[in-house]
């Protein structure tokens, strides 16, 4: 018998060699193989020359093969479908010469940082191109000029800051465009040309609403029925358009289509859409989403997520990797919403993990003082500042929703001198206090020492306990320790306060499951100012595996942040699993997406 199983589908001989611990092509492959599955093996490298004698080969699956390089040194004249997803490819060779009949190319979930200008030259038959979940920061001009038959283009979940203005030129057959979850600030004037795109996904970007956004705003208004919110496992044809999913990152997540453009110059031009209107902003509301996440039993591949499940409005966010493999839990998160989104509670089976949430914040340089200063944000009348950001995202071509959460706040009457601009939360009086753990870490040594680690931990889940004190200590490696004390005071109205103490040191790797707070109070913003010569970059690190129960019903809220700290009006942060626990790629200057 063959190493691989053999069958036939639509007149093509199908050979399935998936998950056979192969490090090379099997020697006994049938010569008339039409469909070849080599996924989930340890091939490392692959050359098309090894398949040139398989003249019937039409479909080739090389997904999850730990590929670091692909060589196109042999022509596969009949190959129509090539799946290279979930590998470690950092670059792509030119494909046109070797694969002239290619109609579908899937290179999603790789590590592509860039594409060479001619990488698609010769792929005149290409109809579907999947590049989601890579590290693409830009695209070369003219990338898609050779692929005039392209129907589906997926660029979601990359790090694209801008798009070449003529990217879509000539793509008359294009019907689906995925651009969600990038770092896009605007769309070039005339980008869409005269294309009629039935399905476009644009949410979860850093859209910056100023006069430059007006072309895009008008396009959204004209194409409101073609803009969708991507939902895991749901065919786009079964969903309803959601143009409000495209939000201004710099205007409290107001929908781009309703950006008024006040004060912007008006100009004429049919394709430029400079017919400016004043449309009122849509107020934000909140909903409560209960879910648990799910991963296939047979796979351990978790990757950067591409979009949201059907229960969640897919808001602006950046994706980060986890630090550990998952364990099954059920989680409840609070979600920011705006009118037009229907978000209902839904429970799903889950494999959440022990995550690390890292928020890059750059301390505000100031020549005047080294002491931490606290500013109490003053709520407007009838507004109760509360936690407003939390989300769940899931990848395209995946069944693995992953929970996330972000900023926490402290209760009234609590004082927490913290050597950075950070927002933390502890419970209000409640019969269901929920433990939280937060870690504050400096990235680099500083001549003005500040505590490099501060962890706030509340007790194990209990119906009566609430945290009362916490001590912050500087880790051993600090050369000039400057200890700071943070106290969590028991709220006045707590019915059964039970004092507890948590001594906080540099966190060791931990498997203890910690939980997020379930009740929210007004925001306290604490700002550390330092001399201009000593900018300090810090990370707020929140390790958690969540299991929230009985969240209070939340109302429409606003988080008040002093003007000088307006850079903290951040997009939401998504926590996602991936095949590696390395976090170092996120500690570099490229990780800047919190800034507008």
């Amino acid at each position: 018998q063959h190493t691989c199983s053999i069958s036939k589908v639509t007149s093509l001989l199908e050979v399935n060699c998936e998950n056979k611990k192969l490090t090379a092509l099997p020697a006994d492959l049938p010569a008339d193989t039409g469909i070849l599955h080599l996924g989930e093996n340890q091939l490392g490298t692959f050359s098309t020359a090894s398949l040139v004698h398989f003249t019937h080969l039409t479909y080739l699956y090389l997904d999850r093969c730990e590929l670091t390089s692909l060589q196109t040194n042999g022509k596969l004249i009949k190959l129509e479908n090539l799946d290279l997803s979930h590998n470690n490819l950092k670059s792509l060779p030119s494909l046109g010469w070797a694969l002239p009949a290619l109609t579908t190319l899937d290179v999603s979930f790789n590590k592509l940082g860039s594409l060479s200008p001619g990488v698609l030259d010769g792929l005149s038959q290409l109809q579907e191109l999947y590049l989601q979940n890579n590290d693409l920061k830009s695209l070369p001009p003219g990338l898609l000029l050779p692929t005039t038959k392209l129907k589906k283009l997926n660029l979601a979940n990359n790090k694209l800051r801008e798009l070449p203005s003529g990217l879509l030129d000539g793509l008359e057959d294009l019907d689906t465009l995925y651009l969600q979850r990038n770092w896009l600030r605007t769309i070039p004037k005339g980008f869409f040309g005269t294309l009629l795109l039935p399905f476009v996904f644009l949410h979860a970007n850093s859209w910056y609403c100023d006069c430059e956004i007006l072309y895009f705003r008008h396009w959204l208004q004209e194409n409101a029925n073609n803009v969708y919110l991507w939902k895991q496992g749901v065919d786009v044809k079964d969903t309803t358009p959601n143009v409000a999913s495209v939000r201004c990152a710099n205007l409290d997540n107001a929908p781009v289509y309703s950006y008024p453009g006040k004060g912007c110059p008006t100009s004429s031009g049919d394709t430029d859409y400079d017919d400016y209107d004043d449309i009122p902003d849509v107020p934000a509301t909140r909903t409560e989403v209960k879910f648990s996440t799910n991963t296939k039993v047979h796979t351990t591949h978790w990757s950067l997520l591409a979009a949201a499940p059907s229960t969640s409005q897919d808001s602006q966010m950046i994706s980060l990797p986890p630090t550990h493999k998952p364990t099954k839990k059920q989680s409840t998160f609070i979600h920011t919403q705006s009118p037009g989104f229907t978000t209902l509670p839904e429970t799903m089976e889950s494999n959440p993990t022990f995550y690390s949430l890292k928020l890059n914040t750059v301390l505000i340089p100031s020549p005047t003082t080294l002491e931490p200063t606290s500013t109490q944000a003053t709520p407007e009348p009838n507004i109760q500042p509360m936690l407003t950001t939390s989300t769940l995202t899931t990848p395209e071509h995946s069944t693995t929703p992953v929970p996330t959460t972000t900023i926490l706040t402290t209760p009234e009457h609590s004082t927490i001198p913290v050597p950075t601009t950070a927002i933390l939360t502890t419970p209000k009086p409640s019969t269901i206090p929920v433990p939280t753990t937060a870690t504050l870490t400096t990235l680099e040594p500083s001549t003005t020492p500040v505590p490099t680690t501060a962890t706030l931990t509340t007790p194990e889940p209990s119906t009566t306990l609430v945290p009362t004190t916490a001590t912050l200590t500087t880790p051993e490696h600090s050369t000039t320790p400057v200890p700071t004390t943070a106290t969590l005071t028991t709220p006045e109205h707590s019915t059964t306060p039970v004092p507890t103490t948590a001594t906080l040191t540099t966190p060791e790797p931990s498997t203890t499951l910690t939980n997020l707070v379930s009740t929210i109070s007004p925001v306290l913003t604490t700002t550390l100012t330092t001399p201009e010569s000593t900018p300090i970059e810090t990370i707020l690190e929140q390790f958690f595996t969540t299991e929230l129960t009985l969240l209070p019903t939340l109302e429409s809220t606003t988080t008040i942040i002093p003007e000088q700290n307006s850079f903290l009006n951040l997009p939401e942060v998504a926590l996602v699993s991936s095949d590696t626990s390395e976090s170092s790629p996120f500690l570099n200057s490229d990780f800047c997406c919190f800034l507008p």
């Epitope: 053999i6 036939k8 639509t10 007149s11 001989l13 049938p30 010569a31 129509e80």
Partner: antibody, heavy 118, light 113 residues
């Protein structure tokens, strides 16, 4: 004209073995995929195995590991080696030709009866 | 595996009648690449081997009378005999040739009324 003639059927005990043959004529045998299909008495048709023109065999789960299909293009012959026979293998076994790379059967032999009984 | 279900299992008809036999598959037999439905029909008379009538849902095999026609798409298919002839009394089988294992319907026996 295309002709397919099966032989080798007979009575065999459970656990026994049997080898069926199919002699082909009237067409270029080596260019066509060939198959075995069976029909239990008074029942419907059930596919047993196929072999492509390049010699690649494939089977349904019900016979995988017990039956082996093979061909000898020089002799214009198709074979089915049946081992570990069971009572439920009792049927008329037909040899059939497939059209090109397609998997419908355009010519059939008259069949040979295999009876598995103790 | 793809399951094939034929109905009726038997029917009685007279010469000249229009006869319709249906076949349902448990999954679509439509190949989106070529827009073909991979379904065949066979006729079998007692003591004889099956004979191919139609393949790819509607393509008549050479030598098959034009009164035999096939239609359908996706999961629902029909064999129609427009005017039943004496030699048409037999058992008819549908077969999916979309993906292995190749599977047949249980058969429809057409008898003389």
């Amino acid at each position: 004209q295309v002709q397919l003639v099966e032989s080798g059927g007979g009575l065999v005990k459970p656990g026994g073995s049997l080898r069926l043959s199919c002699a082909a004529s009237g067409f270029t045998f080596s260019s066509f995929a060939m198959s075995w299909i069976r029909q239990a008495p008074g029942k419907g048709l059930e596919w047993v195995s196929s072999i492509t023109s390049a010699g690649t065999p494939y089977y349904p789960d019900s016979v995988l590991g017990r039956f082996t299909i093979s061909r000898d293009n020089a002799k214009n012959s198709l074979y089915l080696q049946m081992n570990s026979l069971r009572a439920e293998d009792t049927a008329v076994y037909y040899c059939a030709r497939s059209r090109g790379y397609e998997d419908y059967f355009d010519y059939w032999g008259q069949g040979t009866l295999v009876t598995v009984s103790s | 595996d793809i399951q094939m279900t034929q109905s009726p299992s038997s029917l009685s008809a007279s010469v000249g009648d229009r006869v319709t036999i249906t076949c349902k598959s448990s999954q679509s037999l439509l190949n989106s690449r070529n827009q073909k439905n991979y379904l065949a029909w066979y006729q079998q008379k007692p003591g004889k081997a099956p004979k191919l009538l139609i393949y790819f849902t509607s393509t008549r095999e050479s030598g098959v009378p034009s009164r035999f026609s096939g239609s359908g798409s996706g999961t629902d298919f029909t064999l129609t005999i427009s005017s039943l002839q004496p030699e048409d009394f037999a058992t008819y089988y549908c077969q999916q040739h979309y993906s292995s294992p190749w599977t047949f319907g249980q058969g429809t026996k057409v008898e003389i009324k």
